[in-house]
Amino acid sequence: ASGSASGSASTLVHNGTSARATTTPASKSTPFSIPSHHSDTPTTLASHSTKTDASSTHHSSVPPLTSSNHSTSPQLSTGVSFFFLSFHISNLQFNSSLEDPSTDYYQELQRDISEMFLQIYKQGGFLGLSNIKFRPG
Amino acid sequence: SVVVQLTLAFREGTINVHDVETQFNQYKTEAASRYNLTISDVSVSDVPFPFSAQSHHHHHH
């Protein structure tokens, strides 16, 4: 069974920012938006809060990406390669929290994985990651 | 254990499947240390274009 809740918002995370695009289970389109000129995408430097795993709140000016010239409906430009990646995390146990994107456990794991990939592939060509799903091993 | 599935996007021509997997495997140890995630059974595959939201399920090894 898939570990992601149906109809949840998925995020393309890239370069420390994120662009949101909501999909429904029936959607056949790409569940994220990639601006055609990624490096030139304008950002809105609005403060946001991130819940941490100590139940504190972090305030910074590292914002979600806002594309002023693009709608939130999924878009694709040519010149993009996609790779599907899967792996096991052997020191974690799957539980129902990983089926619910609103839980702290889900959000913490998603945050860690997103940050890890942003760092591993930050040099050259990486546009982002999307559709993180969790399921039992 | 937990299986994680996701999609990575790159500018076309900048990386191939082998390099995606190699780079990820290179940092598995650091991931264990930094994020407390012990990673194994890494699998990477191309997602054919046009991409669909369901294409995950056809490419899991």
Epitope: T52, H58, E115, I120 | T29, E30, A32, S33
Partner: antibody, heavy 122, light 106 residues
């Protein structure tokens, strides 16, 4: 020149909380992790946790989870570590130290604050 | 958690002596870091990734090892080298430190 400057010594009663600050300068604050490490008198160094100022993401040693809060104020290039429900065993020098994201993680914690002495006593 | 055991816990040596400190891990690690600490001061990164000298560290210091056994060696001890040395692993979370080796003047 890279510098991490910590707040001054604190004396606290058991059950209280303490908040230690660590102001960074000489580099781009959001590019590096900040770690917190403590050292009780005559004891080995003990790792507490980290925060990534670029995202606010953090992680804690299970020993301290639930009692420690690590935050940053990016506009002030300052990290904070708050430890609650203090007990006498928390008497220690608390250090902040910066390190690197991938792929430079293996460089280690290369700059440290001068340390903040926290004394817990009734 | 991975335990790091340093030996000896302390040693007395003279200027010019060759000194070796060992760090043994309870399970295999990819690499270790070494820190130098003097009384009342913060630790300083001394050797990173097992064998790389940190900035400003004299070439008389060297590090080696793999798996579970690592060493820090000073080829010819100098007065400024008297301090406590700690090893650290970061192959497993949480990072852990050895108990330290205090190098004293004989």
């Amino acid at each position: 020149e890279v510098q991490l400057v910590q707040s001054g010594a604190e004396v606290k009663k058991p059950g209280a909380s303490v908040k230690v600050s660590c102001k960074a300068s000489g580099y781009t604050f959001t590019d590096n992790y900040i770690n917190w490490v403590r050292q009780a008198p005559g004891q080995r160094l003990e790792y507490m946790g980290w925060i990534y100022p670029g995202s606010g993401n953090n992680k804690f040693n299970e020993k301290f989870k639930g009692r420690v809060t690590i935050t940053v104020d990016t506009s002030a290039s300052t990290a904070y570590m708050e430890l609650s429900s203090l007990r006498s065993e928390d008497t220690a020098v608390y250090y902040c130290a910066r390190d690197y994201p991938f792929p430079s993680y293996h460089y280690g914690m290369d700059y440290w604050g001068q340390g903040t002495t926290v004394t817990v006593s009734s | 958690d991975i335990q790091l055991t340093q030996s000896p816990s302390s040693l007395s040596a003279s200027v010019g002596d060759r000194v070796t400190i060992t760090c043994s891990a309870s399970s295999s690690v990819s690499y270790i870091h070494w820190f130098q600490q003097k009384p009342g001061k913060a630790p300083k990164l001394w050797i990173y990734s097992t064998s790389n000298l940190a900035s400003g560290v004299p070439s008389r210091f060297s590090g080696s090892g793999s798996g579970t056994d690592f060493t820090l060696t000073v080829s010819s001890l100098q007065p400024e080298d008297f301090a406590t040395y700690y090893c650290q692993q970061r192959s497993s979370y949480p990072p852990t430190f050895g108990g330290g080796t205090k190098v004293e003047i004989k």
